[in-house]
Amino acid sequence: SEVEYRAEVGQNAYLPCFYTPAAPGNLVPVCWGKGACPVFECGNVVLRTDERDVNYWTSRYWLNGDFRKGDVSLTIENVTLADSGIYCCRIQIPGIMNDEKFNLKLVIKPAKVTPAPTRQRDFTAAFPRMLTTRGHGPAETQTLGSLPDINLTQISTLANELRDSRLANDLRDSGATIRIG
């Protein structure tokens, strides 16, 4: 079953996914999709890389890690309850049925309410704004480019690490970050 990750409304969510290129710069196409991994490709693609670069992304979704070293972990900016659900990270290894597929479950919790200082019985509560994500068409039918001849030595989602988005944000903020898109 899929590994579960958590974030609060308004935070950035972090979904880890890694692979080790056989040689530096010898990259494998990767796609991220909203929804469980299908038989082929990714459904409802939110971000895609090719052998060289990020070639497709949608707003609020980006890679903060060094994807050229195989860190293709997804960051989702300013999450809402509508971002809850399963996400697919697919490492598109050349060859028939070689893809590595990882289903990651994102659980969004309502933001913690911090009451303002109150006098007598008056109080103020902060209600997070409810937003909806825009729908994606059937982008799964398209494919771009060809696949390189490459062998992978390791693929891992680090299932037992970086499960907490706050920890992930701390780690991310401790070093230089490059926002793509």
């Epitope: 929804g35 469980a36 299908p38 082929f40 490709e41 039918t141 060809s146």
Partner: antibody, heavy 116, light 107 residues
């Protein structure tokens, strides 16, 4: 308008060969996965094979592996299914369709009958 | 291989009625499910993908729901052109598989 038109079906003896064609129009053929699905009389639809354009990866259901070959000719916007060593159980209407996981649209189908 | 089972095999309804077609997977397929309509002598037509997303040009009276192993296609108010064969299809597990179909006929 997106359109797929199959041809090449017919009557063939067991062990024989047939080549099905699918002419595509109305979309950028070279960027899409393409698929063959068949429907035997009174049976459910069966996914047969598909091809990833660009990468060229080809996938087959076990029952046709080694006997059927899927291919494309992007210059002609055409999809093909070369069927060798045909068996009676290959008798079906063969549809070409656009897509990898779900299929839209489909052609009208071409009937393949394998019988002696 | 994942077995997709549709019920009922035949559904007899009148125009204007609400039709509910069921599809069950032998193991979880998440939301990776499509519905197709097929009329005699015609190719299947995609109605729903992702369990609940209507394909382009499909009327709003068609809706899909469910996740995991249990799915439903609902036609809110049957029109004469809706009487046909309906198939579900999973695309989570290799190989892609279809249900045996539900025939929706006029009562």
């Amino acid at each position: 308008e997106v359109q797929l038109v199959e041809s090449g079906g017919g009557l063939v003896q067991p062990g024989g060969s047939l080549r099905l064609s699918c002419a595509a129009s109305g979309f950028t053929f070279s960027t899409y996965w393409m698929t063959w699905v068949r429907q035997a009389p009174g049976k459910r639809l069966e996914w047969v094979a598909n091809i990833k354009q660009g990468g060229g990866d080809k996938y087959y259901v076990d029952s046709v592996k080694g006997r059927f070959t899927i291919s494309t000719d992007n210059a002609k916007n055409s999809l093909y299914l070369q069927m060798n060593s045909l068996r009676a159980e290959d008798t079906a209407v063969y549809y070409c369709a656009r897509g990898s996981n779900w299929f839209d649209p489909w052609g009208q189908g071409t009937l393949v009958t394998v019988s002696s | 291989e994942i077995v997709m089972t549709q019920s009922p095999a035949t559904l007899s309804m009148s125009p204007g009625e609400r039709a509910t077609l069921s599809c069950r997977a032998s193991q979880s397929v998440y939301d990776n499910l499509a519905w197709y309509q097929q009329k005699p002598g015609q190719a299947p037509r995609l109605l729903i993908y992702g369990a609940s997303t209507r394909a382009t040009g499909i009327p709003a009276r068609f809706s899909g729901s469910g996740s995991g192993t249990e799915f439903t296609l609902t036609i809110s108010s049957l029109q004469s052109e809706d009487f046909a064969l309906y198939y579900c299809q999973q695309y989570t597990h290799w190989p892609i598989t279809f249900g045996q179909g539900t025939r929706l006929e006029i009562k």
